[in-house]
């Protein structure tokens, strides 16, 4: 009779994480008597996966009735596969004795595990940036296998090209991670914009995973200020307004200065939102010009989102023709921002 051969017909087997892997092994002879063992890896550090003779292997089941002498099929099924199970598995025939001695090994079957990448996590800069600045976004996804993966960046559906991507580790591993950094130039219209990181992998069956970052958490649009003077109905009273336009985020504090002295400080509350996501706000003062002999310099000073204050001034002429100033139609006064200067 020909000498026993151990046949492992599959050079490689690929299994999705969580599924069972079937590793095939048959022998060509019933001689010699002795157990079959399965190992992962070769050499002295090989790991015992299954021993026909003894031991408890809760994740391993034999495909056929391997306890009987006539059996020549020693295929096994390993349940609940994880990326850590990847490797080359050897079916090894032993000869019965004291001790059992290795008789012949199969050629090995390489088990690769298809593991889905984790949901991409996109993170932006720690501090806000203003339009025209370039900011970096990072995207990370972990735990996938095999190593091949595709990552794309989008801003509002438009693919970005300025990015760098690394997949780690470089060598063989049970699973891999991807890290990508994209550069995005901010514009004033980006409050409603989104940056999307899209990851495509063989395990996702054409349905890529996406991670998003809202530029509203990254951008700071500084306000534009306009101070205007409007007469009101009451004689010798002038309404001075400070229009604060197109700012984001809402966090804003406004201070009125009269000839350099703080007159009133208030925080933006009832703002109006523009279509592009920025905000507008208006504050006003009622100035009694008859109480002033000299011209008054009114300054609207705005501190936006903790940044250095910006200001706009208006010179209020009090010496000439106060009654003429008051003869124009006055703007409606809500009362909430009313300030009389005496």
């Amino acid at each position: 009779e020909e000498e026993l051969q151990v046949i492992q017909p599959d050079k490689s087997v690929s299994v999705a994480a969580g599924e069972s892997a079937i590793l095939h092994c048959t022998v060509t002879s019933l001689i010699p008597v002795g157990p079959i063992q399965w190992f992962r890896g070769a050499g002295p550090a090989r790991e015992l996966i299954y021993n026909q003779k003894e031991g408890h292997f809760p994740r391993v089941t034999t495909v056929s009735e391997s306890t009987k002498r006539e059996n020549m099929d020693f295929s096994i099924s390993i349940s609940n596969i994880t990326p850590a199970d990847a490797g080359t598995y050897y079916c090894v025939k032993f000869r019965k004795g004291s001790p059992d001695t290795e008789f012949k090994s199969g050629a090995g079957t390489e088990l690769s595990v298809r593991a889905k990448p984790s949901a991409p996590v996109v993170s932006g800069p720690a501090a806000r940036a203003t339009p025209q600045h370039t900011v970096s976004f990072t995207c990370e996804s972990h735990g996938f296998s095999p190593r091949d993966i595709t990552l794309k960046w989008f801003k509002n559906g438009n693919e970005l090209s300025d990015f760098q991507t690394n997949v780690d580790p470089v060598g063989e591993s049970v699973s891999y991670s991807i890290h990508s950094t994209a550069k995005v130039v901010l514009t004033r219209e980006d409050v409603h914009s989104q940056v999307i990181c899209e990851v495509a992998h063989v395990t996702l069956q054409g349905d890529p995973l996406r991670g998003t970052a809202n530029l509203s958490e990254t951008i700071r649009v500084p306000p534009t200020l306009e101070v205007t003077q409007q007469p009101v109905r009451a004689e010798n009273q002038v309404n001075v307004t400070c229009q604060v336009r197109k700012f984001y985020p809402q966090r804003l504090q406004l201070t009125w200065l009269e000839n350099g002295n703080v007159s009133r400080t208030e925080t933006a509350s009832t703002v109006t939102e523009n279509k592009d996501g920025t905000y507008n706000w208006m504050s006003w003062l009622l100035v009694n010009v008859s109480a002033h002999r000299d011209d008054v310099k009114l300054t609207c000073q705005v501190e936006h989102d903790g940044q250095p204050a910006v200001s706009k001034s208006h010179d209020l002429k009090v010496s000439a023709h106060p009654k003429e100033q008051g003869s124009n139609t006055a703007a409606e006064n809500t009362g909430s921002n009313e300030r009389n200067i005496y």
């Epitope: 002795g34 003894e54 002498r69 019965k96 059992d100």
Partner: antibody
């Protein structure tokens, strides 16, 4: 159903010969090692002989040179040829299958009685 | 030859008892140990192989353990049909050898 049936036992004089047969059914006979085990009346079990799948044979010192074991796979039959019989060979002879992967005995016949006496 | 020594030679127990029979080999038999049950006038019946593997169709009240040279057969809850003679056998090395047997009797 897996079955082993022994035959050929009987009374024989010391120095005589006897051939025991074991008819196997219900399994692929050629794929199993086969064994003979005996049991003297009121005593324990004693292994007598084994024949492997490839025809290799094994005996204990007590019967070596006197007993031969053979198999005829085409007839699903196992044989034990016993020569130069002694009184000490008196026993019930069982044929058994080495049915497990490790050649452990899993199926036994009902036995046949061999008496060596003058 | 490898000697197999069983103890005790006989044992009296009651229905429902848990009993243990031991078997010692004169040298390491690498767990190639079997246990058999035999009732009067009947052929032996296989219970355990490779020291702890339950033969197909054998109830789980029978269990085997041990390694190297010392082995045990345990019957967890004796039933009337379990009263019989039990044999251990090493089949690691030719000549295969049996223990002398343990007769389990009803108390």
């Amino acid at each position: 159903e897996v079955q082993l049936v022994e035959s050929g036992g009987g009374l024989v004089q010391p120095g005589g010969s006897l051939r025991l047969s074991c008819a196997a059914s219900g399994f692929t006979f050629s794929s199993f090692d086969m064994h003979w085990v005996r049991q003297p009346t009121g005593k324990g079990l004693e292994w007598v002989s084994t024949i492997g799948i490839a025809g290799d044979t094994y005996f204990p010192g007590s019967v070596k040179g006197r007993f031969t074991i053979s198999r005829e796979n085409a007839k699903n039959s196992l044989y034990l040829q016993m020569n130069s019989l002694r009184a000490g060979d008196t026993a019930v002879y069982y044929c058994a299958r080495g049915g497990n992967w490790d050649d452990a005995l899993d199926i036994w016949g009902q036995g046949t009685m061999v008496t060596v006496s003058s | 030859d490898i000697q197999m020594t069983q103890s005790p030679s006989s044992l009296s127990a009651s229905v429902g008892d848990r009993v243990t029979i031991t078997c010692r080999a004169s040298q390491d038999i690498n767990n190639y140990l079997a246990w058999f049950q035999q009732k009067p006038g009947k052929a032996p019946k296989s219970l355990i192989y490779t020291a702890s593997s339950l033969q197909s169709g054998v109830p789980s009240k029978f269990s085997g353990s041990g390694s190297g040279t010392d082995f045990t057969l345990t019957i967890s809850s004796l039933q009337p049909e379990d009263f019989a003679t039990y044999y251990c056998q090493q089949y690691n090395t030719y000549p295969y050898t049996f223990g002398q047997g343990t007769k389990l009797e009803i108390k």
